[in-house]
Amino acid sequence: MNGRVDYLVTEEEINLTRGPSGLGFNIVGGTDQQYVSNDSGIYVSRIKENGAAALDGRLQEGDKILSVNGQDLKNLLHQDAVDLFRNAGYAVSLRVQHRLQVQNGPIGHRGEGDPSG
């Protein structure tokens, strides 16, 4: 019997300092370029090697970026989001949503968690 796939969703504030090649990641998404079906959010498509995001280590490919310096990224055209990042300044605060895939075992199976008592 196969286990079902669940997702653990967490949010994190990530502060990056712009490097010589920018923030060091690419984005996809927007109201005119949906990356996820029925979701016009902005997602990280690629982390550039040795860029600011890679060196920080917290931002991951597939993360959803919720805001930049407090500016909500809901319902933006793709290029509007790109330009927000481009003009965000030297110190950039990102609110991101990580979506971690959790593989649950078959029903009745208990993983090696903490003792229940």
Partner: nanobody
Framework: HVQLVESGGGLVQAGGSLRLSCAVS??????MGWFRQAPGKEREFVAA????????IYGDSVKGRVTISRDNAKNTAYLEMNSLKPEDTAVYYC????????????????????WGQGTQVTVS
């Protein structure tokens, strides 16, 4: 893909009027500007309007004769030109600020990241 398409140019007699339009797609909430370039001359600032439409500035050579406006529902900017003179003959370009919801409008050509192909205005 960002596109700015100007229309409304043409041949007009001195003293006449024209209304130029600039339809924008691919970006929104941008300060918008109009510039012009006459043959053999540098590109010159004409007018600019804030992304909310509440603030405008004009170049000295056209002040009092042109009005810039916008319709955000249509993502379109307009340039109403009156009392046209032969020296207004030029290619008129529409431009969008490179910054999303930028705070201050400017006549600085360098801040305008997106440009249309231009529309010819000839005043005889």
């Amino acid at each position: 893909h960002v596109q700015l398409v100007e229309s409304g140019g043409g041949l007009v007699q001195a003293g006449g009027s024209l209304r130029l339009s600039c339809a924008v797609s691919g970006v929104s909430f941008r300060n918008m500007g109009w510039f012009r370039q006459a043959p053999g001359k540098e590109r010159e600032f004409v007018a600019a309007i804030s992304w909310g439409g509440d603030s405008t500035i004009y170049g000295d050579s056209v002040k009092g004769r042109v009005t810039i406006s916008r319709d955000n529902a249509k993502n379109t900017a307009y340039l109403e030109m009156n009392s046209l003179k032969p020296e207004d003959t030029a290619v008129y370009y529409c431009a969008a600020d490179g910054r999303f919801r930028a705070g201050r409008i400017s006549s600085d050509l360098g801040l305008y990241h997106y440009w249309g192909q231009g529309t010819q205005v000839t005043v005889s």
